[in-house]
C-alpha cells in the first residue's frame, strides 16, 4: 500500500490521543535505556510503511502484536485516514485470523514495540524546512 495520500495530521492526532498511550502501557516496566532504535524512516509515508510492517507482520520471536490494543487502533486510524487502505488489508486480515496465537509478551516483542515508538516519534516530528 502507498501511504502518500493519507491524512498525516489526522493520523498524528489519533496517535497522540490514544495509540501512544497504549504503546506506553505495553512497555510499562521496561527501562527507558533498554533499547536503542535501529529501525528508521525518512519521511511520513515511509514511516507508515515501516509502522505497518512492524505492527502487523509476525517476526521471529514476536508473532502476537497484531491483536494488541495499539495495533487495532493503528489499523483503525489507517483505515479511516488512508484512502483505499481497508481494501488492501482484507486478505491480510483473513490470513492473520488463521494463524492466531496465544498472546505472549516476549523480550523480542518489547524490543519491537520500542522500535515502533521510535518510528512513530519520527513520523510525528516537525517537518524540516530546507535550509
Amino acid at each position: 500500500y502507498d501511504f502518500t495520500n493519507c491524512d498525516f495530521e489526522k493520523i498524528k492526532a489519533a496517535y497522540l490521543s490514544t495509540i501512544s498511550k497504549d504503546l506506553i502501557t505495553y512497555m510499562s516496566g521496561t527501562k527507558s535505556t533498554e533499547f536503542n532504535n535501529t529501525v528508521s524512516c525518512s519521511n511520513r509515508p515511509h514511516c507508515l510503511t515501516e509502522i505497518q510492517s512492524l505492527t502487523f507482520n509476525p517476526t521471529a520471536g514476536c508473532a502476537s502484536l497484531a491483536k494488541e490494543m495499539f495495533a487495532m487502533k493503528t489499523k483503525a486510524a489507517l483505515a479511516i485516514w488512508c484512502p483505499g487502505y481497508s481494501e488492501t488489508q482484507i486478505n491480510a486480515t483473513q490470513a492473520m485470523k488463521k494463524r492466531r496465537k496465544r498472546k505472549v509478551t516476549t523480550n523480542k516483542c518489547l524490543e519491537q514495540v520500542s522500535q515502533l515508538q521510535g518510528l512513530w516519534r519520527r513520523f510525528n516530528r516537525p517537518l524540516l524546512k530546507q535550509q
Epitope: 497522540l16 527507558s32 532504535n37 515508538q117 513520523f123 516537525p126
Partner: antibody, heavy 119, light 107 residues
Framework: QVQLVQSGAEVKKPGASVKVSCKAS????????IEWVRQAPGQGLEWMGI????????YYAQKFQGRVTMTADKSTSTAYMELSSLRSEDSAVYFC????????????WGQGTTLTVSS | DIQMTQSPSSLSASVGDRVTITCRAS??????LVWYQQKPGKAPQLLVY???NLADGVPSRFSGSGSGTQFSLTISSLQPEDFATYYC?????????FGTGTKLEIK
C-alpha cells in the same frame, strides 16, 4: 530518571566563542533529538535549533546560521552548543531540552546556563 | 517562518478564578501546538502537547483546545502555584517558534 545537566555560567568578551554542554542520563541518548533554546533577561523563549545525536544531523534557526554549531558525543551522552562571534545581545540563559517519547514536544529541560557577554 | 502571537501579554487573576490564554498562529499548524509553564529562574515545564493532550503529572485543571490557527489554554480554578509565565510553541515545521508569553499575576 531522565536528567539533563548543563555546564556552569560563562562570562565572555565580545567576539569570543562559548561552548555549552548538556549531559543526558536516564534514557537512550541517541533515540531522541535535543533542542537548544535561549532566553535573554526579562524576555521570552527563542528557539535556536535541534540536533539528532544518532546521526549528527542539525537544523539551525536562520538567525544563528553561521554562528552556531551543535554537536553530540554518543560515548558520553553529551550534547554541545557552540556560539561564536559573541555580542552583548547574546547574553542570555541557554537551555537544552529532550524530545518527548511521542516526538510532539520537548519534555525534559536542562537547568540552564547563564552567558554574560561584556567587555 | 510561522509567527505565534499570545494574548493577553499579562493577566491579573485571583485564586479560584478560571482563566484562558490564547495563542494565534500566522498559518495553519493543525494540532501541532505545545504549552509550557515557566517560573522565574527555572526551565519551562511541559503542560500540553498536540494542542489538547495533558503531559504526565499535569493537574486536570489545565486543558488545551483549538486547531488550525487558534488555540487556548484554560486553567479551570487557579491555584497559588499557577502564577507564572505561559508560552505556546508551534510544532509543525522548523523553526519551532514560541509565542510571546503571557504573565499570569496575582490580583
Amino acid at each position: 530518571q531522565v536528567q539533563l545537566v548543563q555546564s556552569g555560567a560563562e562570562v565572555k568578551k565580545p567576539g569570543a566563542s562559548v561552548k555549552v554542554s548538556c549531559k543526558a542520563s536516564g534514557y537512550a541518548f541517541t533515540n531522541y533529538l535535543i533542542e537548544w533554546v535561549r532566553q535573554a533577561p526579562g524576555q521570552g523563549l527563542e528557539w535556536m535549533g535541534i540536533i539528532n545525536p544518532e546521526s549528527g544531523d542539525t537544523y539551525y534557526a536562520q538567525k544563528f546560521q553561521g554562528r552556531v554549531t551543535m554537536t553530540a558525543d554518543k560515548s558520553t551522552s553529551t550534547a554541545y552548543m557552540e556560539l561564536s562571534s559573541l555580542r552583548s545581545e547574546d547574553s542570555a540563559v541557554y537551555f537544552c531540552a529532550k524530545e518527548s517519547l511521542t516526538g510532539s514536544s520537548y519534555d525534559y529541560w536542562g537547568q540552564g546556563t547563564t552567558l554574560t557577554v561584556s567587555s | 517562518d510561522i509567527q505565534m502571537t499570545q494574548s493577553p501579554s499579562s493577566l491579573s487573576a485571583s485564586v479560584g478564578d478560571r482563566v484562558t490564554i490564547t495563542c494565534r498562529a500566522s498559518e495553519n499548524i493543525y494540532s501541532n501546538l505545545v504549552w509550557y509553564q515557566q517560573k522565574p529562574g527555572k526551565a519551562p515545564q511541559l503542560l500540553v502537547y498536540g494542542a489538547r493532550n495533558l503531559a504526565d503529572g499535569v493537574p486536570s485543571r489545565f486543558s488545551g483546545s483549538g486547531s488550525g490557527t487558534q488555540f487556548s489554554l484554560t486553567i479551570s480554578s487557579l491555584q497559588p502555584e499557577d502564577f507564572a509565565t505561559y508560552y505556546c510553541q508551534h510544532f509543525y515545521e522548523t523553526p519551532l517558534t514560541f509565542g510571546t508569553g503571557t504573565k499570569l499575576e496575582i490580583k
